[in-house]
């Protein structure tokens, strides 16, 4: 079965996030997907989201982040830009299907930005997690003002029996430091 | 450590499927997205798609759409690539590989690849 | 899609000599490059990540550069057991496409 799980991030200012969700090809290729923010005890807030309906491979950018959907491979990849600490939390994708609520997608996103400047000459860190170039044609998509009561914040069990971390060989220096935590089987 | 192990070498005529089975061990095998790559003999690296093994969801590149699926048993961490309608130009070394990061990273670095299937397509 | 132009197709060199291979994307592609390298009957091994960062286990003499367009890949010291063919690969959006390879001898 499907588990729900979250991915741990962390980053330092100034980086990226770049992130995909996967969806259903032959049901949601051309819905409105979009980018949400979840913080504790509250309903999730949509910072970004596609046009209606989306179109295939053209970045629509809000502000820092930038979406992109890829409907022949069933893709969405999410970029936030010059991450601030105030951007950390724990974030979704979702796909709006009027009049339905909307569907989440796996996995969430835990999102921690520290303080620190990341693009020191010959560091090891990937430097071009710093500097994204802006598409040409970005678009500000209209997102539906709804979100979904059933996606309030639900913290992960107490018992680490599921947990499971990066192998041990897997060197990503700094860019994508992820831990796997399952939030519910 | 992580292993991809492939199923043996394959003959078929044209207009038949081959199924492709890799089976993953050293890891949690619902954590990480695999990609299908093929080689045809002396010939370069083509990406087929890729497969999320946690949602089942997968993708592949528009040539191999209407002929490819690509499935998993997550009972035995078994990842399966079936290609239809089977042509000479099938014929190749078909790999199963494992990404750098998890599933949700945008990293398609191919890190861990199993030891490969020889498909032949012949009349 | 994306076109990654390798160049040279073959070369020979000797032990000890530094090798330079190029790889051009036909698009800015920021640093999501990848080079691999693929020995005989072998399956491919993935040297460097991102352009620049070394697999872990990979000798310190391969190092990889460059961003945007034109990207570089070098051996500081030839060894006899790099010959293979090696492979760049990008992943700046999809689909993800592999150069048609530069494949290395020894002279």
């Known amino acids: 079965a499907t588990k729900l799980t979250e991915e741990k991030y962390e980053l330092k200012e100034g980086q990226t996030l770049d992130v995909k969700c996967d969806y259903t090809l032959e049901k949601f290729a051309s819905s409105q997907k979009a980018w949400q923010i979840i913080r504790d005890g509250e309903m999730p807030k949509t910072l970004a989201c596609t046009e209606r309906p989306s179109k295939n491979s053209h970045p629509v950018q809000v502000g820092r982040i930038i979406l992109e959907d890829y409907h022949d491979h069933g893709l969405l990849r999410v970029r936030m830009v010059n991450l601030q600490v105030e951007d950390s939390g724990l974030y979704q994708c979702v796909i709006y299907q009027p009049p339905k609520e909307p569907h989440m997608l796996f996995d969430r996103i835990r999102l921690v930005v520290t303080k620190g400047f990341s693009g020191t000459p010959g560091s090891n860190e990937n430097s071009t997690q710093n500097v994204y170039k802006i598409p040409p044609t970005t678009t500000k998509a209209l997102c539906p003002l709804y979100t979904s009561p059933r996606t309030v914040t639900q913290a992960p069990p107490k018992s680490t029996a599921d947990v499971s971390t990066p192998d041990s060989e897997i060197n990503l220096t700094n860019v994508t430091d992820i831990i796997r935590v399952p939030v519910f089987n | 450590q992580v292993q991809l192990v492939q199923s043996g070498a394959e003959v078929k005529k044209p207009g038949a499927s081959v199924k492709v089975s890799c089976k993953a061990s050293?890891?949690?095998?619902?954590?990480?997205?695999i990609n299908w790559v093929r080689q045809a003999t002396g010939q370069g690296l083509e990406w087929m798609g890729w497969?999320?093994?946690?949602?089942?969801?997968?993708g592949s590149v528009k040539k191999f759409r209407d002929r490819v699926t690509m499935t998993r048993d997550t009972s035995i961490s078994t990842a399966y690539m079936e290609l239809s309608s089977l042509r000479s130009e099938d014929t190749a070394v078909y790999y199963c590989?494992?990404?750098?990061?998890?599933?949700?990273?945008?990293?398609?670095?191919?890190?861990?690849w199993g030891q490969g299937t020889l498909v032949t397509v012949s009349s | 899609d994306i076109q990654m132009t390798q160049s040279p197709s073959s070369l020979s060199a000797s032990v000890g000599d530094r090798v330079t291979i190029t790889c051009q994307a036909s698009?800015?592609?920021?640093?999501?490059l990848n080079w691999y390298q693929q020995k005989p009957g072998k399956a491919p091994k993935l040297l460097i990540y991102?352009?620049?960062n070394l697999e872990t286990g990979v000798p310190s003499r391969f190092s990889g550069s460059g961003s945007g367009t034109d990207f570089t890949f070098t051996i500081s010291s030839l060894q006899p057991e790099d010959i293979a063919t090696y492979y760049c690969?990008?992943?700046?959006?999809?689909?993800?496409?592999f150069g048609q390879g530069t494949r290395l001898e020894i002279k």
């Open positions: 050293g890891y949690t095998f619902t954590s990480y997205d």
């Open positions: 497969m999320n093994p946690n949602s089942g969801n997968s």
């Open positions: 590989v494992r990404l750098i990061g998890y599933s949700s990273a945008w990293k398609w670095s191919f890190q861990h």
């Open positions: 698009r800015d592609i920021s640093k999501y």
């Open positions: 690969q990008h992943y700046d959006n999809i689909p993800i496409t």
């Open positions: 991102d352009a620049s």
